[in-house]
């Protein structure tokens, strides 16, 4: 079964900078990746970036840079302008779509015990109905 993993990392040198790493584990090619914060795609989440494997990326503040790391993983750099660093308590979600085969989504956040510079362990939080688009024709 395909799976999505999410890691949230605080930069050691810049405490207001965060990076979200997401990856897709499974067969098939990815046609679109959507990154949101505050909840899953379409369920209260706010879009941060959309990445297409051939057509490029689109991003919205506070996203700073979205990029592909491999054919099945992406990273999104975020700049937290607020003094209270709300990112530390925020959920980030990544949705990998493979049209028309299916879409899969998981969420993650910075662990409370994280020291700056240490990446969160890859513990995906599956979203119920994440594979509701998994059709067979």
């Amino acid at each position: 079964t395909p799976e999505v993993w999410v890691q949230v990392q605080m930069e050691a040198t810049e405490l207001s900078s965060f990076t979200v790493h997401c990856g897709f584990l499974g067969p098939g090619s990815i046609s679109l990746v959507t990154v949101s914060w505050g909840g899953p795609d379409g369920a209260g989440g706010t879009k941060l970036a959309v990445l297409h494997p051939e057509l490029g990326t689109r991003q919205w503040a506070p996203a700073r840079q979205a990029r592909w790391e491999t054919q099945s993983s992406i990273s999104l750099a975020l700049e937290d302008s607020g003094a209270s660093s709300p990112f530390a308590n925020t959920t980030f979600c990544c949705k990998f779509a493979s049209f028309p085969e299916g879409s899969w989504e998981s969420c993650g956040s910075l662990p409370p015990s994280s020291d700056p510079g240490l990446s969160a362990p890859p513990t995906p939080v599956p979203i119920l109905r994440a594979d509701h688009h998994h059709h067979h024709h």
Epitope: S31, L32, G42, V50, H52, A97
Partner: nanobody
Framework: QVQLVESGGGSVQAGGSLRLSCAAS????????MGWFRQAPGKEREGVAH???????RYVESVKGRFTISQDHAKNTLYLQMNSLKPEDSATYYC??????????????WGQGTQVTVSS
Amino acid sequence: QVQLVESGGGSVQAGGSLRLSCAASRYTSRTDCMGWFRQAPGKEREGVAHIDSDGIPRYVESVKGRFTISQDHAKNTLYLQMNSLKPEDSATYYCVVGFKFGDYCAPNDWGQGTQVTVSS
């Protein structure tokens, strides 16, 4: 995620018409295009038509003048009126909502698809 349910597919003779409908579970304001893709066995998947958030319809060259895409915001429904159908229009048609990259509507959510068969 947005639930999309297509209807209106079927079998028709060449030159005939069909009207596809797509009911969305909720308003899709967080994406910026809504449209139709099609996939025929052994052929490349293609975007048939979509409507931007500004309401402008866009069509693939092969259906211009024959297909018309429209929306009913009150019913959260997308339509595709298909006239002068040709055998090469036979395919599974998917309703999609997505994000614009230039003139392309990249699917973020889609329905299960409805089959259109045009016989000569």
